[in-house]
Interface confidence: low
């Protein structure tokens, strides 16, 4: 009698190795004998396919040669005409011996940085990667993190990171090593001792010492008022990733010298620049009497801080006078720099407006210090913190020289708006008024070492700090 | 370090619709597939729905079919499910989880990361 | 639809104690099978996956097993922190279906 079709053995998950054979049995009773069509993932599995072999009616599927690839479900169906088709499904599992597909590279990294090293596998059962630094497994800790994917991550890497790297990809069929990768950490061009400022006799000799540090060993050279030093001698030494320069000087005029520190990191440079001013005694005289000329302000540094077009005075005591004061104010903001968002625009146009005075041009042209008031506003308000700290440094010694002196007015010493109006400058980029101050946080002192006026608004006075420099 | 972070839950009324995503991290949402799983109070947890985006391929649990939809935007690496025609029996914390792979092989790695899960009621 | 029968649906052990407990699908399945604790107001987090793999950072006193339409999870010795809920779960070509879960408690 006919019979409809009846799967008796339900195909079975089958793990199978790569390269190994793997056969699925779907046994049928049925009257008359059915026709029996295999799918893999439901796409149907040809008869002729040279990868397979399809045995006893159809109801034994081998795969001759199992590779990672072949992973799915596969299904058969038999049908004879009698009643509906019947389907059985089951699970091929490609169990494979771990793989490293993407093995680490090795890796040139500026310390700071994030690097990756990649370690990506296949397996299955998947594969567990573990890391191997030197002979030793690595640790992981919060820096450092063996990723899901497997590859290793190592956050703001240090000079000790650098060294050999492999990874470890285990599963219960094997294991297998990537080859040893180095990761190599540079480290940015950084100025260990800074060179120091002198007042000398005129005809003295100076030696000037600047000391770097950096991975590849910096490259040390000086610049004297902008220009490459033209006379005097440099001796230099390196020891343990360390150069020392030493410049020998014969004094004749006052002059800006800066030590500038290089190293490359592929196609960039990082530099580091000291500076340090040598002054002639006989030449210090009274700032009334101080030579210069005014110019419009075309240097980089101060460029969002000073009026567009603004004319500045420039000191002819310096060589170039415009190449000084611009690596004056560069050096001064570098010593200032780890500075909150609110003090910072604010220092950065004090800074700028003293080294950079505005001139009043006439048969004398003469530099305008800032007023009084507006510097207090900046010691006191804006930087309240940052200048206690400056000024614990300077009792301590810890700045160079007076290098800092240049840099930072002493607020007390500048003359005060009332005095003169016209006498003093105001910092176009900082107006305040006692409505804005109600944001800022108590001061440092007990009370302010002046009594902080009502200043008339003016369209020079275009700054106040409001929610952009806001507190919070 | 990978994290799934789920949002959107909330209060809505019978028939409402809701938007929940789930914002990745620490891997990428198109090597991966990603699942929503949902638990309603004091209950076991229930498979919702799952996207593989490197297929665009999609699969739902029948409660749900033809009112959710599962979506993900690679380039946020995020995954979405748009809830609409909401039933009272749709009130559950609604997980989004992560399993290697493509809807073919990521049953066989189990669902390694899990969100925290955002809690969806319906009521009137 | 594929059933997961989970069993039992409770059960309260001492520490130190060895615990199973079993899955039976409703019909011949792969061994895409993954065993979750959950703890209360937290996400399940994944113990074993393919029937019998431990998952990284997983004590090794949990195993997983396989036998026809049966799966297994054997905790060989309970920990106190291992008091929670435990459930299956398999996946066909992505139709996921969980177990009702088994709650372990302290006896």
């Known amino acids: 009698l006919p019979k409809a079709p009846v799967i008796t053995t339900p195909l079975e998950t089958v793990d199978a190795l790569v390269e190994e054979v793997a056969t699925f049995m779907c046994a049928v009773e049925s009257y008359p004998q059915p026709e029996i069509s295999w799918t893999r993932n439901k796409i149907l599995i040809k008869l002729f396919d040279t990868r397979y072999s399809i045995r006893e009616n159809g109801q034994l599927l081998t795969i001759l040669s199992v590779e990672d690839s072949d992973d799915g479900i596969y299904c058969c169906t038999a049908n004879n005409g009698v009643g509906g088709a019947v389907e059985s499904c089951g699970a091929l599992q490609v169990k494979m011996k771990p793989k490293i597909t993407r093995p680490p590279i090795n890796v040139k990294i500026i310390e700071g940085l994030k690097a990756v090293l990649p370690c990506t596998t296949m397996g299955n059962p998947k594969p567990s990667v573990s890391w191997i630094k030197g002979d030793s497994p690595l640790r992981e800790n919060s820096r450092i993190a063996v990723l899901e994917s497997g590859s290793l991550r190592i956050h703001n890497v240090q000079k000790e990171d650098a060294g050999q790297y492999r990874c470890v990809a285990k599963n219960s069929l094997g294991t297998a090593y990537s080859k040893v990768v180095k990761l190599e950490v540079e480290v940015f061009a950084r100025i260990l001792r800074a060179p120091e400022s002198h007042n000398v006799t005129f005809g003295s000799f100076v030696t000037l010492h600047c000391t770097a540090t950096g991975i590849p060993v910096p490259t040390i050279t000086w610049i004297e008022n902008g220009n490459a030093v033209s006379s005097g001698s440099i001796q230099e030494s390196v020891k343990d990733r360390v150069i020392d320069s030493r410049l020998q000087l014969f004094i004749t005029k006052p002059g800006l010298y800066t030590c500038i520190a290089t190293n490359k990191h592929g196609e960039k440079f990082s530099t580091a620049k000291a500076a340090a001013t040598i002054s002639i005694a006989e030449w210090s005289k009274p700032q009334k009497d101080n030579k210069g000329y005014c110019a419009q302000y075309r240097g980089e540094v101060c460029n969002a801080v000073l009026a567009k077009d603004a004319l500045v005075f420039l000191n002819t005591s310096y060589a170039d006078p415009e190449e000084a004061q611009e690596l004056l104010v560069h050096t001064a903001w570098n010593e200032l720099k780890v500075v909150s968002p609110v003090c910072r625009p604010a220092a950065e146009a004090l800074l700028c407006n003293h080294i950079f005075q505005e001139c009043s041009p006439g048969v004398v042209p003469t530099p305008i210090p800032i007023c009084r008031e507006y510097c207090l506003a900046v010691k006191e308000l804006f930087c309240a913190k940052e200048w206690l700290v400056m000024e614990e440094k300077t009792h301590r010694g810890l700045y160079r020289s007076e290098m800092h002196l240049l840099s930072v007015p002493e607020c007390s010493k500048l003359p005060s708006m009332h005095w003169d109006p016209t006498a003093c400058a105001r910092l176009p980029h900082l107006d305040y008024n006692k409505e804005n101050l109600k944001t800022f946080p108590p001061m440092t002192s007990s009370k302010p070492s002046v009594d902080i006026p009502n200043l008339p608004s003016s369209s020079s006075s275009s700054f106040s700090v409001s929610p952009t420099y806001s507190m919070t | 370090e990978v994290q799934l972070v789920e949002s959107g839950g909330g209060l809505v009324q019978p028939g409402g619709s809701l938007r929940l995503s789930c914002a990745a991290s620490?891997?990428?949402?198109?090597?991966?597939?990603i699942h929503w799983v949902r638990q309603a109070p004091g209950k076991g947890l229930e498979w919702v729905a799952s996207?593989?985006?490197?297929?665009?391929?999609?699969s739902y649990a029948d409660s749900v079919k033809g009112r959710f939809t599962i979506s993900a935007d690679t380039s946020k690496n995020t995954a979405y499910l748009q809830m609409n025609s909401l039933r009272a029996e749709d009130t559950a914390v609604y997980y989004c989880a992560r399993s290697e792979g493509d809807r073919y092989v990521s049953g066989y790695f189990g669902m390694d990361y899990w969100g925290q899960g955002t809690l969806v009621t319906v009521s009137s | 639809d594929i059933q997961m029968t989970q069993s039992p649906s409770s059960l309260s052990a001492s520490v130190g104690d060895r615990v199973t407990i079993t899955c039976r699908a409703s019909q011949s399945v792969s061994s895409a099978v993954a065993w979750y604790q959950q703890k209360p107001g937290k996400a399940p987090k994944l113990l074993i996956y393919s029937a019998s793999s431990l998952y990284s950072g997983v004590p090794s006193r949990f195993s997983g097993s396989r036998s026809g339409t049966d799966f297994t999870l054997t905790i060989s010795s309970l920990q106190p922190e291992d008091f929670a809920t435990y459930y299956c779960?398999?996946?066909?070509?992505?139709?996921?279906?969980f177990g009702q879960g088994t709650k372990v408690e302290i006896k």
């Open positions: 620490g891997f990428t949402v198109s090597s991966s597939s």
């Open positions: 996207i593989s985006s490197s297929y665009g391929s999609t």
């Open positions: 779960q398999q996946s066909g070509v992505w139709l996921i279906t």
